[in-house]
Interface confidence: low
């Protein structure tokens, strides 16, 4: 691996090596490797045996690794509303008398305008607006599969509140498989949460637009209030573009084994498009706070040095025990935008723009 | 702010908002800002000003930043498991007859041996081994809070399977809630997931050590396999020189604009311990996959060069727009481990100790 | 949410009046803010409107060229500055909060306005 | 002359329906700019009553209500009551003159 300067890979392994000596020592906060003298002879006894492999055995139920950024999801993501159809459809008239569930219909056809292809779309978020509410209720959400047949999508514990509230529920799967049925009215369903042995099985919690006793003021619900699917999505002619060019690589075990490559705080940096950019066409947000890391991360062991007195320093200067440890953003935001193509005025989500915070990595 | 050279921090914020330029640019795939000829004066129609918004709007169930790792985190965990009170303790008696659930019991004291104070404790795992199932089943877990009162914990779509599985629930704040509760016997319950129509409510998942129809096999059911806490926690003796030891602050903005701090494959490097680190302590692993990051992450932007060339460049070398894009770990995996204290083994949890992919960043 | 409205008066023809509306109860560096009159027993009247960083302002053709509206967003301070003043000037004018970022799309808040009585 | 005309003066009885209208053009109301509703008491600043065509504001009665159709739009009371004698406003953004624009205002007079 050759960059301007020729890396001497024996000599960043050695460094690496003699950063995991530290990193280990300084975790466990031991100032040398603990005396073995009293160690008992034999194998490990079972129990610990067993403890140890219940660490280390990946179960069902936690997270798996995150995934790499896919190249699709680097580009920004056109944003558009589907509102669901409306209530006074008969659509909804079976439904009516049902206590425990509120029901959403959605028509294929609005979401294949915003997404004509299932591929393409990144998110999709059902959001619904709850109205203020003095109970706490716990609720599910389920995607209509036939007639009879409801499957589970999600739940949420609804705790009191004085306000209306935004809830949001991810649906892109759902959404996606609505696109590969071809087009037809796909329904939805927010539940009370009923336990084996509840009494009360009524949903407490109404819902700007479609909750019952509110039915008679649907004339007056401002449509943007009704429940609604937020989309996300490659629009058709950048995803052309996607398929036609080189893809880039997840920068993963597979592909960096056999490859070459190379090359600690958040600075204030607010970008003004105006100003520092010099641009006009992005109508929303005037600008935004981008920030930027900057700072040295110093190499902080070597054989050379006292043990004790850099394990300290570890945890702030080189807590992955990096070779070269390098100042990077940690949290990073999206940032939404809203510009014109001709007169069309488009709202597109940019990812990863906003730098919250930095590390030593 | 100086480094072993004077870093020009003007120029430094200029090559950023030349980056964000080619990133924005980049991620909507334009070669260069669209023109604004057509577009109508004004304000922007309210339904898109909508659609920015909710996008841009932060909504109840969309997740949070991720928190940047709090000190303690950066430290090894002991590892103990504390398995469920026996079976043939009459505090099950009561449960005996319900179909739709199975309950276990532990005891707080024993969790407090492993745990003294509950700040100390990292993560606790409710383990259950299920057996092997043809049918499909929607189950759910609680927590019990008063005799007759259960708090929903979560839920899990079991699918058949073909061998024993271990489901994992994270129940790190009940146990610290049972920690904060003074001694005594603590319950969970694990259910049938129950529609408010479902007429079929009954459990057909069978939990190792604790479904009804093996109870007759209980003298056979390996302790081992019995539902069980996993608990990581600070050891008491570790806490204390945390709490002494001068706090490591967060990177975020609050610290960072008033203080000082600067430095793309994966390679694959194999510690062996007793190879590379001359050490015979650690009794497993005998080493681990460590790896690490190296390769240049070019800047590859700036006024004098041809917009449409770069932009395809962005997305592998500077997907964050950095002034000085960088090669760091992007996925880390903890490492578990055991060593003797004395006579006394130990395991113990190191995180962010494998590097499995990295980025420019 | 309250706003109040200051600086109105008597002025002679040709004179100059600055108007300011201090804010409180929002966030008055994200909203829109617009001015409306009133001429004694007529109707509403849209004056101006400003952007949340003020980069941007509306005037209607009546007044153009001659008010500048702009806003102090750490002071939580909204102003009008009218130049060139006309008999036909006359009027309660009021400070409102705009339903949107521009201020031109509706106004959900009032000041209880203040008296502009342009005479010789 | 408003860009948006309204009849300048109605009456109805206590317990009425009245409609009072707001008639626009292209560039503003049928353009699909949002319709805001306003109400002034006697002697008081105007208040807020229908944002976006027909949602309500805060603390206003459902008895108010709007709607809009082509470039016609319409606020609607129900139950007609004394309190609510006043001045009723519509104001919409006009593309063509890139301003908001008022009504010329109705007076609602409850007999």
């Known amino acids: 691996l050759s960059t301007c300067k020729t890396i001497d890979m024996e000599l960043v392994k050695r460094k690496r090596i003699e950063a995991i000596r530290g990193q280990i020592l300084s975790k466990l906060r031991l100032a040398s490797p603990p005396s073995q003298g009293e160690v008992p002879p034999g194998p490990l006894p079972e129990a610990v045996l067993a403890l140890y492999n219940s660490t280390r055995d990946r179960v069902a139920g936690e997270s798996a690794d995150p995934e790499p950024e896919p190249e699709a999801d680097y580009y920004a993501k056109e944003v558009t509303r589907v509102l669901m159809v409306d209530r006074n459809n008969a659509i909804y008239e079976k439904t009516k008398d049902i206590s425990h569930s509120i029901y959403m219909f959605f028509n294929t056809s609005d979401i294949r305008e915003a997404v004509p292809e299932p591929p393409l779309l990144s998110r999709a978020e059902l959001r619904l607006q709850r109205l203020k509410s003095s109970v706490e209720q716990h609720v599910e959400l389920y995607q209509k599969y036939s007639n009879n047949s409801w499957r589970y999508l999600g739940n949420r514990l609804l705790t009191p509140t004085d306000t209306p509230e935004w809830l949001s529920f991810d649906v892109t799967g759902v959404v996606r498989q609505w696109l590969n049925q071809g087009d037809g009215i796909q329904g939805a369903r927010f539940s009370a949460h009923c336990s084996c042995d509840s009494k009360d099985n009524k949903l407490h919690v109404e819902i700007n637009g479609i909750s019952p006793k509110r039915r008679g003021d649907l004339g007056t619900i401002h449509d943007m209030n009704r429940p609604f699917l937020l989309l996300m999505a490659t629009p058709l002619e950048r995803a052309q573009h996607l398929h036609s060019s080189r893809h880039r690589r997840a920068l993963d075990t597979n592909y960096c084994f056999s490859s070459t490559e190379k090359n600690c705080c958040v600075r204030q940096l607010y970008i003004d498009f105006r100003k520092d950019l010099g641009w006009k066409w992005i109508h929303e947000p005037k600008g935004y706070h981008a920030n930027f890391c900057l700072g040295p991360c110093p190499y902080i062991w070597s054989l050379d040095t006292q043990y004790s007195k850099v394990l300290a320093l570890y945890n702030q200067h080189n807590p992955g025990a990096s070779a070269s440890p390098c100042c990077v953003p940690q949290a990073l935001e999206p940032l939404p935008i809203v510009y014109y193509v001709g007169r069309k005025p488009k709202v597109e989500q940019l990812s990863n723009m906003i730098v919250r915070s930095c590390k030593c990595s | 702010l100086s480094t072993c050279k004077t870093i020009d921090m003007e120029l430094v914020k200029r090559k950023r908002i030349e980056a964000i330029r080619g990133q924005i640019l980049s991620k909507l795939r334009l070669a260069s800002p669209p023109s604004q000829g057509e577009v109508p004066p004004g304000p922007l129609p309210e339904a898109v000003l909508a659609l920015y918004n909710s996008t841009r709007d932060r909504v109840a169930g969309e997740s949070a930043d991720p928190e940047p790792e709090p000190e303690a985190d950066y430290y090894a965990k002991e590892v103990t498991r504390v398995l469920m009170v026996d079976r043939n303790n009459a505090i099950y008696e009561k449960t005996k007859d319900i179909s739709h659930s199975i309950y276990m019991f532990f005891n707080t004291s024993d969790i407090r041996e492993a745990v003294p104070e509950p700040p100390l404790l990292s993560r606790a795992e409710l383990r259950l081994q299920r057996l092997k199932s043809s049918v499909e089943q929607h189950v759910e877990l609680y927590q019990k809070y008063s005799n007759n009162s259960w708090r929903y914990l979560g839920n899990r779509l079991l699918t058949p399977t073909d061998t024993p599985e271990w489901l994992s629930f994270d129940v790190t704040g009940v146990v610290r809630q049972w920690l904060n509760q003074g001694d005594g016997i603590q319950g969970a319950r694990f259910s049938a997931h129950c529609s408010c129509d479902s007429k079929d409510n009954k459990l057909h998942v069978e939990i190792n050590g604790i479904s009804p129809k093996r109870r007759g096999d209980l003298g056979t059911i390996h302790d081992m396999n019995r539902p069980f806490l996993l608990l990581m926690a600070t050891p008491l003796e570790r806490a204390q020189h945390l709490h002494s030891s001068r706090h490591r602050r967060a990177l975020d903005t609050n610290y960072c604009f008033s203080s000082t701090e600067k430095n793309c494959c994966v390679r694959q490097l194999y510690i062996d311990f007793r190879k590379d680190l001359g050490w015979k302590w650690i009794h497993e692993p005998k080493g681990y996959h460590a790896n690490f990051c190296l390769g240049p992450c070019p800047y590859i932007w700036s006024l004098d060069t041809q917009y449409s060339k770069v932009l395809a460049l962005y997305n592998q070398h500077n997907p964050g727009a950095s002034a000085s894009p960088c090669c760091v770990p992007q996925a880390l995996e903890p490492l578990p481990i055991v060593y003797y204290v004395g006579r006394k083994p130990k395991v113990e949890q190191l995180s962010n100790m494998i590097v499995r992919s990295c980025k420019c960043s | 949410l309250q706003l109040v409205e200051s600086g109105g008066g008597l002025v002679q023809p040709g004179g100059s009046l600055r108007l300011s509306c201090a804010a409180s109860g929002f966030t008055f560096s994200r909203s829109g803010m617009a001015w409306v009159r009133q001429a004694p027993g007529k109707g509403l009247e849209w004056v101006s409107a400003i952007t949340p960083g003020g980069t941007a302002t509306y005037y209607a053709n009546s007044v153009k060229g001659r008010v500048t509206m702009s806003r102090d967003n750490a002071k939580n301070t909204l102003y009008l500055q009218m130049n060139s003043l006309k008999s036909e000037d006359t009027a309660v004018y009021y400070c409102?909060?705009?339903?949107?970022?521009?201020?031109?799309?509706?106004?959900?808040?009032w000041g209880k306005g203040t008296l502009v009585t342009v005479s010789s | 002359q408003s860009v948006l005309t309204q009849l300048s003066s109605m009456s109805g009885s206590p317990g009425q329906t009245v409609t009072i209208t707001c008639t626009g053009s292209?560039?503003?109301?049928?353009?699909?700019?949002?319709l805001s509703w306003y109400q002034q008491l006697p002697g008081t600043a105007p208040k807020l009553l229908i944002y976006n065509t027909n949602n309500r504001a805060s603390g206003v009665p459902n008895r108010f209500s709007g709607s809009k159709t082509g470039s016609l739009a319409s606020l609607t009371i129900t139950g007609l009551q004394a309190e609510d004698e006043a001045d009723y406003y519509c104001g919409c953004y006009d593309d063509s003159l890139n301003t908001y624009v008022f009504g010329g205002g109705t007076k609602l007079t409850v007999l």
């Open positions: 409102a909060k705009g339903l949107v970022s521009s201020g031109l799309n509706g106004m959900d808040y």
């Open positions: 292209s560039s503003n109301i049928g353009g699909g700019y949002y």
